[in-house]
Interface confidence: low
């Protein structure tokens, strides 16, 4: 899906009000300093790739992130502000329902969340500083 | 309204240095990233570096890392651009841009930079 | 670093006419292309972004389009006010460069 069409402002908002708290809840408890952020992103398209790509494609040691709160709010905020991103995400849906129906907080997910904080942060400020 | 001004022209003898100001209004100074872009006379724009004005880390391309200095004052909303050991080359209009994703939606008015002797 | 170039270098036209003003890149850089605009004494003025997108107060007679590596600025019907000097700006990463321009002058 190509993000550049998206509603960045709108996106921001959802975060800052929402996103951004259940990101936080989610990481209750871990120590802010406990992972390292490997993952980074230059521009807001960019970002919300890599948002898209952590939150929603099931990895190694973490796969029930799809059904978290945050996860949700993602979802919808990509559905409602990036045109045609619903359409793209059908077999995705499908395969969010084969994921286990357990919520299942592994540190393998909380380093991923981990990451995912930093991706929000840098899509607030997007500019990469070098490539 | 988001402005950028920068000071007036420059005159300045080669080996000398110059100091650009750039004043920004209309936004959150530390929102987004300041660049630095030059042109030379009748040239195309060259692109020199950035700084984030939020912690005044600084990227700057290879040619100018050992000459440009590239600084931001917080208080007033007023980034600058510190270019040394002038040579006649480095005549040009240096204009500051802002960015958030790397394209410029606001520029400076640019400062004329002559050189000679 | 990636390279940007533009062509034509200069071309003449007529008002009413349809000009386009091509730029490849050297490597990927995706839809992260801008347009600028540029007049004698001025400062450049942002004309699209991410490859496509029209920015705030943009005619729209100005258009962007991608293919691959190489991007495309189409004027559909030139105005007097058009005839100046027109960049490309690939904003994918550091370096940021230019391509060398086109000047659109009067035929």
């Known amino acids: 899906y190509d993000f550049t069409n998206c509603d960045f402002e709108k996106i921001k908002a959802a975060y800052l009000s929402t996103i951004s708290k259940d990101l936080i809840t989610y990481m209750s408890g871990t120590k802010s300093t406990e992972f390292n952020n490997t993952v980074s992103c230059s521009n807001r398209p960019h970002c919300l790739t890599e948002i898209q790509s952590l939150t929603f494609n099931p990895t190694a040691g973490c796969a029930s992130l799809a059904k978290e709160m945050f996860a949700m709010k993602t979802k919808a905020a990509l559905a409602i502000w990036c045109p045609g991103y619903s359409e793209t995400q059908i077999n995705a849906t499908q395969a969010m329902k084969k994921a286990r129906k357990s919520k299942v907080t592994t540190n393998k997910c909380l380093e991923q969340v981990s990451q995912l904080q930093g991706l929000w942060r840098r899509f607030n400020r997007p500019l990469l500083k070098q490539q | 309204e988001v402005q950028l001004v920068q000071s007036g022209a420059e005159v300045k003898k080669p080996g000398a240095s110059v100091k650009v100001s750039c004043k920004a209004s209309g936004y959150t100074f530390t929102t987004y990233w300041m660049h630095w872009v030059r042109q030379a006379p009748g040239q195309g724009l060259e692109w020199m570096g950035m700084i984030d004005p939020s912690d005044s880390e600084t990227t700057l391309i290879q040619k100018f890392k050992d000459r440009v200095t590239m600084t931001v004052d917080k208080s007033t909303s007023t980034a600058y651009m510190e270019l040394s050991s002038l040579r006649s080359e480095d005549t040009a209009v240096y204009y500051c841009?802002?960015?958030?994703?790397?394209?410029?939606?606001?520029w400076g008015q640019g400062t004329t930079v002559t050189v000679s002797s | 670093d990636i390279q940007m170039t533009q062509s034509p270098s200069s071309l003449s036209a007529s008002v009413g006419d349809r000009v386009t003003i091509t730029c490849r890149a050297s490597e990927n850089i995706y839809s992260y292309l801008a347009w600028y605009q540029q007049k004698p004494g001025k400062a450049p003025k942002l004309l699209i972004y991410?490859?496509?997108t029209l920015a705030e107060g943009v005619p729209s007679r100005f258009s962007g389009s991608v293919s691959g590596t190489d991007f495309t600025l189409t004027i559909s019907s030139l105005q007097p006010e058009d005839f100046a000097t027109y960049y490309c700006q690939h904003h994918y990463g550091t370096p940021w460069t230019f391509g060398g321009g086109t000047k659109v002058e009067i035929k």
């Open positions: 991410f490859a496509k």
């Open positions: 841009a802002r960015t958030l994703d790397g394209y410029y939606d606001y």
